[in-house]
């Protein structure tokens, strides 16, 4: 649900953080209409996620942890 | 409706480990969190840490994070907490609460009753 | 020391209007939204409003919140007696300490 390399709606699914290698934060004031995190998966798929969903937090969160500790 | 049974008092010594369990019944399993918060006596809540069972992978506040194993079993559809090296000021009532991880909001909507944990020196 | 700072107590007599606290930071309130929570002595906490204003269903609509900026608010009118209880904030947290953190409770007394 891009274009333009911005998202325009979220994924209905919830995806297993196996499958996701990092993300990019995308903010509706700089340029597209809305917030969204785009989960970069090992398959090269960029998935637009909703930022405010628990398991999009904590995917995060745990992607955020792992550069910390590199 | 959604329930969640959490196993009954512990009395531990300081040193030793204890193991406190949450049982979720009336709903599937797969869109669910489970933290566990614990309250002190005449203390706030403070969050020890928590799991999504799907992912299989758990997550701890930093000041638990080298003490605590929050750990799944999707078949019996329990989530545990276990506390290491205890100290007295662990004596806390250890609860499990519930968020729905597919929600754009991050409440827990349903509680357990509360584990007591108490630590003896 | 809680990362969200609450007034330890508040009152207020039948009928009133009572607004408790709560204050954070820009990486928790500031860019998260707010989760209130009702203890009654001796019970598990109860969700009482979740996404800074929102109800679930069952809680009175005395029972509203709000949030602008770094701070948030839980307000009760015409407070009733069985209202007495401690009442926390709490938010997800973008730090890595900890994911949700909590307000230190405020003690509602019912005079």
């Known amino acids: 649900a891009s274009n333009f390399d911005c998202c325009l709606g979220y994924t209905d699914r919830i995806l297993h953080p196996k499958f996701i290698v990092g993300f990019t934060r995308q903010l509706a004031n700089e340029g597209c209409d809305i917030n969204a995190i785009i989960f970069h998966t090992k398959k090269k798929l960029s998935v637009c996620a909703n930022p405010k969903q628990t398991w999009v937090k904590y995917i995060v969160r745990l992607l955020s942890k792992k550069v910390k500790n590199m | 409706q959604v329930q969640l049974q959490q196993s009954g008092a512990e009395v531990k010594k300081a040193g030793s480990s204890v193991k406190v369990s949450c049982k979720a019944s009336g709903d599937t399993f797969s869109n669910f969190a489970i933290s566990w918060v614990r309250q002190a006596p005449g203390h706030g809540l403070e969050w020890v840490g928590g799991?999504?069972?799907?992912?299989?992978?758990?997550d701890y506040a930093q000041n638990f994070t080298d003490r605590v194993t929050i750990s799944a079993d999707k078949a019996t559809k329990t989530v545990y907490m276990e506390l290491h090296s205890l100290r007295s000021d662990d004596t806390a009532v250890y609860f499990c609460?519930?968020?729905?991880?597919?929600?754009?909001?991050?409440?827990?909507?349903?509680w357990g009753r509360g584990t007591l944990v108490t630590v003896s020196s | 020391q809680s990362v969200l700072t609450q007034p330890p107590s508040a009152s207020g007599t039948p009928g009133q209007r009572v607004t408790i606290s709560c204050s954070g930071s820009?990486?928790?309130?500031?860019?998260?939204?707010v989760n209130w929570y009702q203890q009654l002595p001796g019970t598990a906490p109860k969700l009482l409003i979740y996404s800074n204003n929102q109800r679930p269903s069952g809680v009175p609509d005395r029972f509203s919140g709000s949030k602008s900026g770094t701070s948030a608010s839980l307000a009760i009118s015409g407070l009733q007696s069985e209202d007495e209880a401690d009442y926390y904030c709490a938010a997800w947290d973008d730090s890595l300490n900890g994911p949700v953190v909590f307000g230190g409770g405020t003690k509602l007394t019912v005079l």
């Open positions: 609460a519930r968020t729905k991880i597919e929600l754009d909001n991050d409440a827990f909507d349903i």
């Open positions: 799991i999504i069972p799907v992912f299989n992978t758990a």
């Open positions: 820009s990486s928790n309130i500031g860019s998260n939204t």
